[in-house]
Interface confidence: low
């Protein structure tokens, strides 16, 4: 329905507090170099000009759509040449391609400062000193660092963070209580972020048909008792928040976000027996739940897929009349009846169904032709099955970290061209797969890993977009979205490369990595380690590892040692010398 | 292909009623949207009246106790009952179905309130 005022219309319906909290989402992943007290200036201009609208739809420019309003005023910014370059000609172009070229210009890689964790004291004085401001610049650092969060859970998350300070600033112990669940968040958020930004990637990369697949997919394994037309309104109204969201148009997508949630909750009884406790919430905790709400279970006495897919004459007369409709029958009545299979099998089930269709509707005699369509997907299902029982038994038998270094390995090897970091960050993701997924049954193994690396890989996309250095990242990222992991899976050691040259300043370390965190000292010698494979792509697993263990004993000893720092550097010869040798550089 | 076919508009009294139809040919599943819009000369398209998958309704301010949307589901068919008719009301009427394949519409039929 129009408005004769959209802003007004928004701010309505949010609220100020989150129309504030929002827009700064979006000024944030927008013009993510920005300091924090440029946007809070934009965000605060943008807020009163909405109450003027509100009190009075018809005054001048109230009537503007949201993207110009919210283009006109980042195109304010004075430094916008100076700090985003090229991104500053945006502001010549007229809606909506001046949108599109904001939303070219986000960096899922921005060059920003690590976020450093200060002192719970401080933290917790800065909270009581101004709550707003606290958590206004935790909503702009993490947008700005992840400008395709999905912004109303962004703000389930502040809620969150609001709570955790609440009540922890007040604890005897404060550090017990609040570092841990800042941790937890820490962790959940980047989590939310990668499984966003493969929804956003699925939309732009791919188009809204595949995001619909997959949403069929999904929400028909979750909500198996629901009839199909049900499934279909809840796919679209969610096609619609996903695709607001990645496009910048948050204050909508937060909106239609919170009615979807009102019209599940209303409907509950022909969706979900599963949705009860989520729907007694609050909004921001109902939608959260909501998305991740376990799955119900199947109705009992399903019939046999067969007889409307396979055995009917009329096949080929339904799929003519209504293709699309009739594969998303299929991949509903296929997924309601698989909890078991991840998302991406179903639907390479369902490409294969349409391929079949697509060529035996056309020979002289359909039915002989489809008739042993099932058969083909056997060795679909049986793929992914075999890969995740062979990682999850080499994951039991070495642990977290080893089995992260073997797939740093095998990755390396794959496409030795992506930098360091990248292949850093990704195995180390592809690898906590184990723990994440491996401690689940059997039925609950594959739709854990295979959906958790299809976001892994997707990391590895958008970061190589940025940056294309491997033609068969480039391949495997654009060719087919549900064949991504199989297509890296393919992938054998990369003859082409030629290895880099040796630098020994690459193997030089110091007396800080004493002080790192487990996981900071892991990264340093994951570093090492890709570096090396980099260096000499044909050693052996057992040279490799003879190297990892002389380089884990050399920290451990120089970080035992009176004088650290000389301990590194003369230790530090010995062992480039030792891994020269042992790995024949 | 779907294809949607409306009927029953025509040249009315201000104060009487006309009962429009749409149906669909073509196999169409999972329905989850029946509307109909209209459109006046110089004027955009505009919502009238919708009814969903729950069978629950939505109308414009502008029709609201005068115009009843209603629903065959078993014949795919959409209807919209129009009384109390008035000269705004003239306009091009179109039937719009939507399910997981796509958004549907018919090609209209003209709706003139005139003395």
């Known amino acids: 329905d129009a408005h004769k005022s959209e802003v007004a219309h928004r701010f309505k319906d949010l609220g100020e507090e989150n129309f504030k909290a929002l827009v700064l989402i979006a000024f944030a992943q927008y013009l993510q170099q920005c300091p924090f007290e440029d946007h809070v200036k934009l965000v605060n201009e943008v807020t009163e000009f909405a109450k003027t609208c509100v009190a009075d739809e018809s005054a001048e420019n109230c009537d503007k759509s949201l993207h110009t309003l919210f283009g006109d005023k980042l195109c304010t910014v004075a430094t916008l040449r100076e700090t985003y370059g090229e991104m500053a000609d945006c502001c010549a172009k007229q809606e909506p391609e001046r949108n599109e070229c904001f939303l070219q210009h986000k960096d899922d890689n921005p060059n920003l400062p690590r976020l450093v964790r200060p002192e719970v004291d401080v933290m917790c004085t800065a909270f009581h000193d101004n709550e707003e401001t606290f958590l206004k610049k935790y909503l702009y650092e993490i947008a700005r660092r992840h400008p395709y969060f999905y912004a109303p859970e962004l703000l389930f998350f502040a809620k969150r963070y609001k709570a955790a300070f609440t009540e922890c600033c007040q604890a005897a112990d404060k550090a017990a209580c609040l570092l841990p669940k800042l941790d937890e968040l820490r962790d959940e958020g980047k989590a939310s972020s990668a499984k966003q930004r493969l929804k956003c990637a699925s939309l732009q990369k791919f188009g809204e048909r595949a995001f619909k697949a997959w949403a069929v997919a999904r929400l028909s394994q979750r909500f198996p008792k629901a009839e199909f037309a049900e499934v279909s309104k809840l796919v679209t109204d969610l096609t619609k928040v996903h695709t607001e969201c990645c496009h910048g148009d948050l204050l909508e997508c937060a909106d239609d976000r919170a009615d979807l949630a009102k019209y599940i909750c209303e409907n509950q009884d022909s969706i979900s027996s599963k949705l009860k406790e989520c729907c007694e919430k609050p909004l921001l905790e109902k939608s959260h739940c909501i998305a991740e709400v376990e799955n119900d279970e199947m109705p009992a006495d399903l019939p046999s897929l067969a007889a409307d897919f396979v055995e009917s004459k009329d096949v080929c007369k339904n799929y003519a009349e209504a293709k699309d409709v009739f594969l998303g029958m299929f991949l509903y009545e296929y997924a309601r009846r698989h909890p078991d299979y991840s998302v991406v099998l179903l639907l390479r089930l369902a490409k294969t169904y349409e391929t079949t269709l697509e060529k035996c509707c056309a020979a002289a005699d359909p039915h002989e032709c489809y008739a042993k369509v099932f058969d083909e997907f056997k060795p679909l299902v049986e793929e992914p099955q075999n890969l995740i029982k062979q990682n999850c038994e080499l994951f039991e038998q070495l642990g977290e970290y080893k089995f992260q270094n073997a797939l740093l390995v095998r990755y390396t090897k794959k496409v030795p061209q992506v930098s360091t970091p990248t292949l850093v960050e990704v195995s180390r993701n592809l690898g906590k797969v184990g723990s994440k997924c491996c401690k689940h049954p059997e039925a609950k193994r594959m739709p854990c890993a295979e959906d958790y690396l299809s976001v892994v890989l997707n990391q590895l996309c958008v970061l190589h977009e940025k940056t294309p250095v491997s033609d068969r990242v480039t391949k495997c990222c654009t060719e087919s979205l549900v064949n991504r992991r199989p297509c890296f899976s393919a992938l054998e050691v990369d003859e082409t490369y030629v290895p880099k040259e040796f630098n020994a300043e690459t193997f030089t370390f110091h007396a800080d990595i004493c002080t790192l965190s487990e996981k900071e000292r892991q990264i340093k010698k994951q570093t090492a380690l890709v570096e090396l494979v980099k260096h000499k792509p044909k050693a052996t697993k057992e040279q490799l590892k003879a190297v990892m263990d002389d380089f884990a004993a050399f920290v451990e000893k120089c970080c035992k040692a009176d004088d650290k720092e000389t301990c590194f550097a003369e230790e530090g010869k010995k062992l480039v010398a030792a891994s020269q040798a042992a790995l024949g550089l | 292909q779907v294809q949607l076919v409306e009927s029953g508009g025509g040249l009315v009294q201000p104060g009487g009623s006309l009962r429009l139809s749409c149906s669909a040919s073509?196999?169409?599943?999972?329905?989850?949207?029946m509307g109909w819009y209209r459109q006046a000369p110089g004027k955009q398209r505009e919502l009238v009246a919708s009814?969903?998958?729950?069978?629950?309704?939505h109308y414009a301010d502008t029709v609201k106790g005068r115009f009843t949307i209603s629903r065959d589901n078993s014949k795919n068919m959409v209807y919209l009952q129009m009384n109390s008719l008035e000269p705004e009301d003239t306009a091009v009427y179109y039937c719009?179905?939507?399910?997981?394949?796509?958004?549907?519409w018919g090609q209209g039929t003209q709706v003139t309130v005139s003395s």
């Open positions: 009814i969903t998958v729950d069978g629950s309704t």
């Open positions: 719009d179905i939507r399910n997981v394949g796509g958004d549907y």
């Open positions: 073509g196999s169409i599943w999972g329905i989850y949207h």
